[in-house]
Amino acid sequence: ALDAAYCFRNVQDNCCLRPLYIDFKRDLGWKWIHEPKGYNANFCAGACPYLWSSDTQHSRVLSLYNTINPEASASPCCVSQDLEPLTILYYIGKTPKIEQLSNMIVKSCKCS
Amino acid sequence: ALDAAYCFRNVQDNCCLRPLYIDFKRDLGWKWIHEPKGYNANFCAGACPYLWSSDTQHSRVLSLYNTINPEASASPCCVSQDLEPLTILYYIGKTPKIEQLSNMIVKSCKCS
C-alpha cells in the first residue's frame, strides 16, 4: 500500500503519500477552529507509470496508452485512497462544540 | 456533473471529461481482443481550482492551500468518477468468448 509505512521510508518519485502539515489560520484562513491549531493532512503526489498501484482497469489502460503517447497528457493521476476524519473543537458564542470533519487526513494513495 | 453532456459542449480548461479513442492493437499492443477494434475510453484532465468539483473535504482543503503554495505541487487532481464496463469478444483457440471488462469507460470526472 502507498501509505506512510512505505512512502515515508523510501525514496519514491512515483505516486506516494507525502507528509503535509496544514495550519488552519495561516494556510486556509480558517479562524473558527479553536483546536487543533493545525494537523497532518498529507497529500498524494508522484508519477503513475504502467501498473504502479493502478486503481481500475481504465487507469491501467491509460498508463499503458501514456507510455506510447506521452504527449496526449492522458495519464492516470496520483490521488487519495483511504481517508480519515479529524476531530475539531470550535465555539458557537461561548459554547464549545466538538465535531468530526470527515475525509480530512489522507492515509494512502492510488493511481486513478 | 463533469460528464460528456457538459464537458464536450464547453471550452473548459478546468477538470473535465475529455474524449479519447483507444485502439487495442495500435495503442496497447493487445492482439487478443477480436471485437471491438477499439473504443471510446475517455479520460479526465484539467486544473482543480478551489471548489471545482471537489470530491472530499481533503480535496477542498488542498485546493485552498494550493492557491497560497503552488510550488508545493499539493493540488487535487482530475480523475475518473463514474466508470462503465466494455463488452469484448475474444477467442480461446477457436472458441469465442464474450466478457465484460469492468471500469473501462470513463463517464464523468472529479477533483480528488
Epitope: 521510508r9 519514491q12 507528509p19 502539515y21 494556510d27 491549531k37 508522484g46 | 510550488e71
Partner: antibody, heavy 119, light 107 residues
C-alpha cells in the same frame, strides 16, 4: 539517524557563482523539505529558500534573482547556487530540514560551511 | 516581510537564575514561532515551536509563552550548559525571519 552535511569551496571570488551541496542521510528527499539558511560572521540568521519534497522551490525575494536550489533524490543531495556574489554573501551556510513539510521550523541542521567571498 | 524584534541583545545572568527573552512580531503570526539555541561554531538547535511546544529531548526548564504580538522564552533555572545565543523565528509567512539574537552570558 538524521544527518545533513554541507560541502563546497570555502573561497569564492566576487561576481562568481557560489555552489554548495547538502548531502542528507536518515531521511528521504521525496518525503521531507530542505531549506538553506545563512549567517554572516557574528550576525543573525537569514532564510534563503527551500526545495519541496515534490521538487518545487520557494526563495527569499531578496535573493530570488540570484538563487537556484535543486536536488538529486537518488544521491540524497540538495544543491544551492548563488550567482554574482559580493563580500556581503560571506557567511556560514546551513542546510536544514523541517519536521513535517509546511511546519516551517527546523528540527535538524547541518554543521554549516563557511564561505568567504574575496579576490 | 515580518520583522522580529528580539530583546535584550545581551543578558548577564548567574546559574540558577530565571531568564526571559522576548520577541515582538511586526504583525500577527498566530503562534507560529520557534526558539533556537546556538553555541559558538555550532548550528542552531530547536528548543520550542508553535510558541509553546517543547521539542523532543529539550529540558523542561525551557518554556515558551505568548501575549498578543509578544513571545517569550523562559529558562526557569539557568544551567551552565545554557550560556549561548538564542534566536526566535517566525514560521508564519514567507520569507521566514529570525530575531537578531540574545546572547546569554555569565554575570
Amino acid at each position: 539517524e538524521v544527518q545533513l552535511q554541507e560541502s563546497g569551496p570555502g573561497l569564492v571570488k566576487p561576481s562568481e557563482t557560489l555552489s554548495l551541496t547538502c548531502t542528507v542521510s536518515g531521511f528521504s528527499l521525496t518525503t521531507y523539505n530542505v531549506h538553506w539558511v545563512r549567517q554572516p560572521p557574528g550576525k543573525g540568521l537569514e532564510w534563503m529558500g527551500l526545495i519541496w519534497n515534490t521538487g518545487g522551490t520557494r526563495y527569499n525575494s531578496a535573493l530570488k534573482s540570484r538563487l537556484t536550489i535543486s536536488k538529486d533524490t537518488s544521491k540524497s543531495q540538495v544543491s544551492l547556487k548563488l550567482s554574482s556574489v559580493t563580500a556581503a554573501d560571506t557567511a556560514v551556510y546551513y542546510c536544514a530540514r523541517d519536521p513535517v513539510p509546511n511546519k516551517w521550523h527546523f528540527d535538524f541542521w547541518g554543521p554549516g560551511t563557511l564561505v568567504t567571498v574575496s579576490s | 516581510d515580518i520583522q522580529m524584534t528580539q530583546s535584550p541583545s545581551t543578558l548577564s545572568a548567574s546559574v540558577g537564575d530565571r531568564v526571559t527573552i522576548t520577541c515582538l512580531a511586526s504583525e500577527d503570526i498566530y503562534s507560529n514561532l520557534a526558539w533556537y539555541q546556538q553555541k559558538p561554531g555550532k548550528s542552531p538547535k530547536l528548543l520550542i515551536y508553535d510558541a509553546r511546544s517543547l521539542q523532543d529531548g529539550v529540558p523542561s526548564r525551557f518554556s515558551g509563552s505568548e501575549s498578543g504580538p509578544e513571545y517569550t522564552l523562559t529558562i526557569s533555572s539557568l544551567q551552565p550548559d545554557d550560556f549561548a545565543t538564542y534566536f526566535c523565528q517566525q514560521h508564519h509567512a514567507y520569507p521566514f525571519t529570525f530575531g537578531q539574537g540574545t546572547k546569554v552570558e555569565i554575570k
